[in-house]
Interface confidence: low
C-alpha cells in the first residue's frame, strides 16, 4: 500500500492541464489518490489520475496519432492527387487536340466528307477518352467503327460522287466491303496497334496513380487499436499523473511504441516500394508507340495516308464494289477523285517549336523522381512520427512509460512493460483488414504494371528526351511507326505544353458521345504552357 500523500501535495497542475482537454474538473482528484482502479497509468505511488481521465487520455492519444499520421502523409498525398488530376486533364487535352488535328485535316483536304467525318472522328475520340478512364471498350472495335463509318462516306463522296439517291442504301454493304477488301490496306491494323498499346499504358498509368491515392487515404484514416491507444497514453500522458508536466518521452521508447502501433502499416512497405519501382519502369517505357501523346497527335497523318491509299486504288475498288454491292451506276475512275488541295495545309497544323519545353513525358519522369523520394515512406513512418512529436533529445532525463529516467534503456523499459501488455503480441496480430485489402490491391496493380507488354531497357537519347520522338522517324518495325511517309506528312513533335488553367472546358467537348462535331478553327491547335503552376481542383 503506497504511503498517504504529504498534506501540502495537490493536483493543481494536472487539473489545469486536464481542463484544456475536458472542460469541467469533476474527474480530477483534488489531491493524489491511490489509483487502484487505473488500468493504463499503473501508479507506483499516489496519482493525480482517475479511470475517467485515463479514458479521455486514451481517446486524445489516438486522435493525436491519427493527426500525426495525416500530417506525415500530407505531402505525398498531395503529390499524387495533384498529379493524377493534372495527368487526367492533360490526357483529355491531348485527345481534344488530336481530334482537332484530325478534323482540321478533313476540313482542309476533304471538305466534302464533313460534317459526317467530324461526327465519326468525334465519336472515336470520345471512345478514346472513355477507354482511358476505364470504360469497358475494345480498342480494335473503336478503330473498326471509325473506318467502317468513314468508308461509305469516302466511297459516295470521293470515289463515286455521282451515285443516284436510290443507290445510297448500300452503306451496310460498303461497311462490310471495307474489311473484306482491306480497302484501307494495313492502316487500320497499324492504328489499332499504336492506339491500343499507347492507351493501355495510359490507362494503367492513371489507374496506378488513383490506387496510390487510395493507399495513402487508407493508411491516412487508420483507426488505431485499443492496445496502441494504451501504449500512446502511457507514453504521452501517464507522466502527468505523477505531476511531471514538462517531461518528454524518451526517443528510443517512442520508436518502440510507434513500431508496435504501426506494425500493420509497415507491412505495406514492401509492396509500396515495388509499386514505385514498377511505375518507374512503366514510365520509362512510355515513348514512341507507348506514348499516347505521340500516337494520338500523329493519328491525323495516318488517317490521311489511309485515305490516300484508298484513292490510289479507287479504280480497282470501284469496279469490285460495283459488282459486290450491285448498284446500278458504274463510274470510271478519274482524277477528280482527288481533292484539289490534297496535302495538309502546313499553316493549320504548325505547332510552334519551343526549346526545352515541358512535355508530358518529362512531367511523368519528374513525378517518378519525386515519388522515389517517398520510397521508404512506410518503413520510415514510426521514426518520422517520433521526430515530429515531442521527444527528449539524446534519451536523457526522459519518460520511459513508467518513470522519469536519466537514460533510456530499451531492455529495462520492456521489462517494466511486461505486466502491462505484450508488445510482441501487438506486433503479431497482423495488419488490419483494410490494410490487407490495400496490400492485395497493390499486389494486383504491381502485377499489371510488370506484365505490361512494353519495350525493356530504353536507351535514353539526349535529343529524344529533350525534343520528343518525331512522328516521321519510322523504324523498320511498322508497329513502331507513327504515320507513313509521303509529301503530306507533317512531323508533329511530342511537345504538348500546358495551359496554366488546365481545367478549362469546352462545353461541346464535355458532352459524352454526341457533342463533338464543331468545326475546328484554324487557331484551335495551340501549344500549352506552365504545367508546374497548375492548381489542382482536388487540392
Amino acid at each position: 500500500q503506497p504511503p498517504p500523500p504529504p498534506p501540502d501535495a495537490t493536483c493543481h497542475q494536472v487539473r489545469s492541464f486536464f481542463q484544456r482537454l475536458q472542460p469541467g474538473l469533476k474527474w480530477v482528484p483534488e489531491t493524489p489518490v491511490p489509483g487502484s482502479d487505473l488500468q493504463v497509468c499503473l501508479p507506483k505511488g499516489p496519482t493525480c489520475c482517475s479511470r475517467k481521465m485515463e479514458e479521455k487520455y486514451q481517446l486524445t492519444a489516438r486522435l493525436n496519432m491519427e493527426q500525426l499520421l495525416q500530417s506525415a502523409s500530407m505531402e505525398l498525398k498531395f503529390l499524387i492527387i495533384q498529379n493524377a488530376a493534372v495527368f487526367q486533364e492533360a490526357f483529355e487535352i491531348v485527345v481534344r487536340h488530336a481530334k482537332n488535328y484530325t478534323n482540321a485535316m478533313f476540313k482542309n483536304n476533304y471538305p466534302s466528307l464533313t460534317p459526317q467525318a467530324f461526327e465519326f472522328v468525334g465519336e472515336f475520340f470520345t471512345d478514346v477518352s472513355l477507354y482511358i478512364l476505364g470504360s469497358d471498350i475494345n480498342v480494335d472495335d473503336m478503330v473498326n467503327e471509325l473506318f467502317d463509318s468513314l468508308f461509305p462516306v469516302i466511297y459516295t463522296q470521293l470515289m463515286n460522287p455521282g451515285l443516284p439517291d436510290s443507290a445510297l442504301d448500300i452503306n451496310e454493304c460498303l461497311r462490310g466491303a471495307r474489311r473484306d477488301l482491306k480497302v484501307f490496306g494495313n492502316f487500320p491494323k497499324l492504328i489499332m496497334t499504336q492506339v491500343s498499346k499507347s492507351l493501355q499504358v495510359t490507362r494503367i498509368f492513371l489507374q496506378a496513380l488513383n490506387l496510390g491515392i487510395e493507399v495513402i487515404n487508407t493508411t491516412d484514416h487508420l483507426k488505431f487499436s485499443k492496445d496502441c491507444g494504451r501504449m500512446l497514453t502511457r507514453m504521452w500522458y501517464c507522466s502527468y499523473c505523477q505531476g511531471l508536466m514538462m517531461v518528454k518521452p524518451c526517443g528510443g521508447y517512442c520508436n518502440v511504441v510507434m513500431q508496435g502501433c504501426m506494425a500493420g502499416v509497415v507491412e505495406i512497405d514492401k509492396y509500396w516500394r515495388e509499386y514505385i519501382l514498377s511505375l518507374e519502369e512503366l514510365v520509362n517505357g512510355m515513348y514512341r508507340i507507348y506514348d499516347m501523346e505521340n500516337v494520338l497527335l500523329g493519328l491525323f497523318s495516318t488517317i490521311h495516308d489511309s485515305i490516300q491509299y484508298v484513292q490510289k486504288n479507287a479504280g480497282k475498288l470501284t469496279t469490285t464494289i460495283g459488282k459486290l454491292c450491285a448498284h446500278s451506276q458504274q463510274r470510271q475512275y478519274r482524277s477528280a477523285y482527288y481533292p484539289e488541295d490534297l496535302f495538309i495545309d502546313k499553316k493549320v497544323l504548325k505547332v510552334a517549336h519551343v526549346e526545352h519545353e515541358e512535355t508530358l513525358s518529362s512531367r511523368r519522369r519528374e513525378l517518378i523522381q519525386k515519388l522515389k523520394s517517398f520510397i521508404s515512406f512506410y518503413s520510415a513512418l514510426p521514426g518520422y512520427i517520433c521526430s515530429h512529436s515531442p521527444v527528449a533529445e539524446n534519451d536523457t532525463l526522459c519518460w520511459n512509460g513508467q518513470e522519469l529516467v536519466e537514460r533510456y534503456s530499451q531492455k529495462a523499459a520492456r521489462n517494466g512493460m511486461k505486466n502491462q501488455f505484450n508488445l510482441h503480441e501487438l506486433k503479431m496480430k497482423g495488419p488490419e483488414p483494410v490494410v490487407s485489402q490495400i496490400i492485395d490491391k497493390l499486389k494486383h496493380i504491381n502485377q499489371l504494371l510488370r506484365t505490361m507488354s512494353m519495350p525493356k531497357g530504353r536507351v535514353l537519347d539526349k535529343n529524344l528526351d529533350e525534343e520528343g520522338f518525331e512522328s516521321g522517324d519510322c523504324g523498320d518495325d511498322e508497329d513502331e511507326c507513327i504515320g507513313g511517309s509521303g509529301d503530306g506528312m507533317i512531323k508533329v513533335k511530342n511537345q504538348l505544353r500546358f495551359l496554366a488553367e488546365l481545367a478549362y472546358d469546352l462545353d461541346v467537348d464535355d458532352a459524352p458521345g454526341n457533342s463533338q462535331q464543331a468545326t475546328p478553327k484554324d487557331n484551335e491547335i495551340s501549344t500549352f504552357h506552365n504545367l508546374g503552376n497548375v492548381h489542382s481542383p482536388l487540392k
Epitope: 487526367q88 461526327e119 465519336e123 472513355l130 458532352a511 458521345g513
Partner: antibody, heavy 117, light 110 residues
Framework: QVQLVQSGAEVKKPGASVKVSCKAS????????MHWVRQAPGQGLEWMGW????????NYAQKFQGRVTMTRDTSISTAYMELSRLRSDDTAVYYC??????????WGQGTLVTVSS | QAVLTQPPSASQTPGQMVTISCSGT????????VFWYQQLPGTAPKLLIY???QRPSGVPGRFSGSKSGTAASLAISGLRSEDEADYFC???????????FGAGTKVTVL
C-alpha cells in the same frame, strides 16, 4: 448484368428539396456518364443533365441550372440528383440513365416525385 | 415545349408498316446522331436505335432508323400488338449544350 436501382417515391411540399439516388451494378461505374431525365405525368422526356462519375464533373440543362445538383459516391457506385426549390410542375418520374457513345442504354426504374401543398 | 418535332400519334393494323418522323434543326439532328427510345406503358424508356440507324442487341430487325439532313425517321415493319408504346427521338443539341427529345409519338396497333 447491368442494373440501375433508384430510391423510392417521394412526396414534397413546394419550396422543399428532393434527393434521388441511383445505385449502379454490373459494370464499371466510373467508366460511363450518368444522366438524369424526367417525365411529367402524361408528358414527354426532359433531359436534366449528366455527371461524369470518374471526375465528378457535371453538365446541367440550362433550365435546371442553379436548382439541380448531381453528385456521386464512387465507393458505393451511386449517383444522386438533388432538385431544390420544388414547384408543383416538378411533379414527375425522375430516371437515371447510363450513357456511353450509344445513347442511354440502361435506365433506372424511375422515382416518382410528387410536389403538393 | 419539345425541341424536336414528332407527330403525336400513329396507327396501323398488325403486319403493316408505320413510320414516325422527327424533325429538328442544324444544331441538333443536322450535326449529331439521332437516338430512338421505346416506352411501354408504366415502364422506363428502352433504347431502340442509336447512331441514326444502329440497333442494340435484342432489338428486332423490324425496327429501323434513318436520318437525312435535319430530319430522322423510325420505321416499324410487320407491326405487332406488343409494339403499342410511346416512341421518342433524341439528339444532342450544340446550341443548348444538352440532349433534346421529341414530345413522343403514341403508336396504336388497330
Amino acid at each position: 448484368q447491368v442494373q440501375l436501382v433508384q430510391s423510392g417515391a417521394e412526396v414534397k411540399k413546394p419550396g422543399a428539396s428532393v434527393k434521388v439516388s441511383c445505385k449502379a451494378s454490373g459494370y464499371t461505374f466510373t467508366g460511363y456518364y450518368m444522366h438524369w431525365v424526367r417525365q411529367a405525368p402524361g408528358q414527354g422526356l426532359e433531359w436534366m443533365g449528366w455527371i461524369n462519375p470518374n471526375s465528378g464533373g457535371t453538365n446541367y440543362a440550362q433550365k435546371f441550372q442553379g436548382r439541380v445538383t448531381m453528385t456521386r459516391d464512387t465507393s458505393i457506385s451511386t449517383a444522386y440528383m438533388e432538385l431544390s426549390r420544388l414547384r408543383s410542375d416538378d411533379t414527375a418520374v425522375y430516371y437515371c440513365a447510363r450513357s456511353w457513345t450509344s445513347g442511354f442504354d440502361y435506365w433506372g426504374q424511375g422515382t416518382l416525385v410528387t410536389v403538393s401543398s | 415545349q419539345a425541341v424536336l418535332t414528332q407527330p403525336p400519334s400513329a396507327s396501323q393494323t398488325p403486319g403493316q408498316m408505320v413510320t414516325i418522323s422527327c424533325s429538328g434543326t442544324s444544331s441538333n439532328i443536322g450535326s449529331n446522331y439521332v437516338f430512338w427510345y421505346q416506352q411501354l406503358p408504366g415502364t422506363a424508356p428502352k433504347l431502340l436505335i442509336y447512331k441514326n440507324f444502329q440497333r442494340p442487341s435484342g432489338v428486332p430487325g423490324r425496327f429501323s432508323g434513318s436520318k437525312s439532313g435535319t430530319a430522322a425517321s423510325l420505321a416499324i415493319s410487320g407491326l405487332r400488338s406488343e409494339d403499342e408504346a410511346d416512341y421518342f427521338c433524341a439528339a444532342w443539341d450544340d446550341a443548348l449544350s444538352g440532349y433534346v427529345f421529341g414530345a413522343g409519338t403514341k403508336v396504336t396497333v388497330l
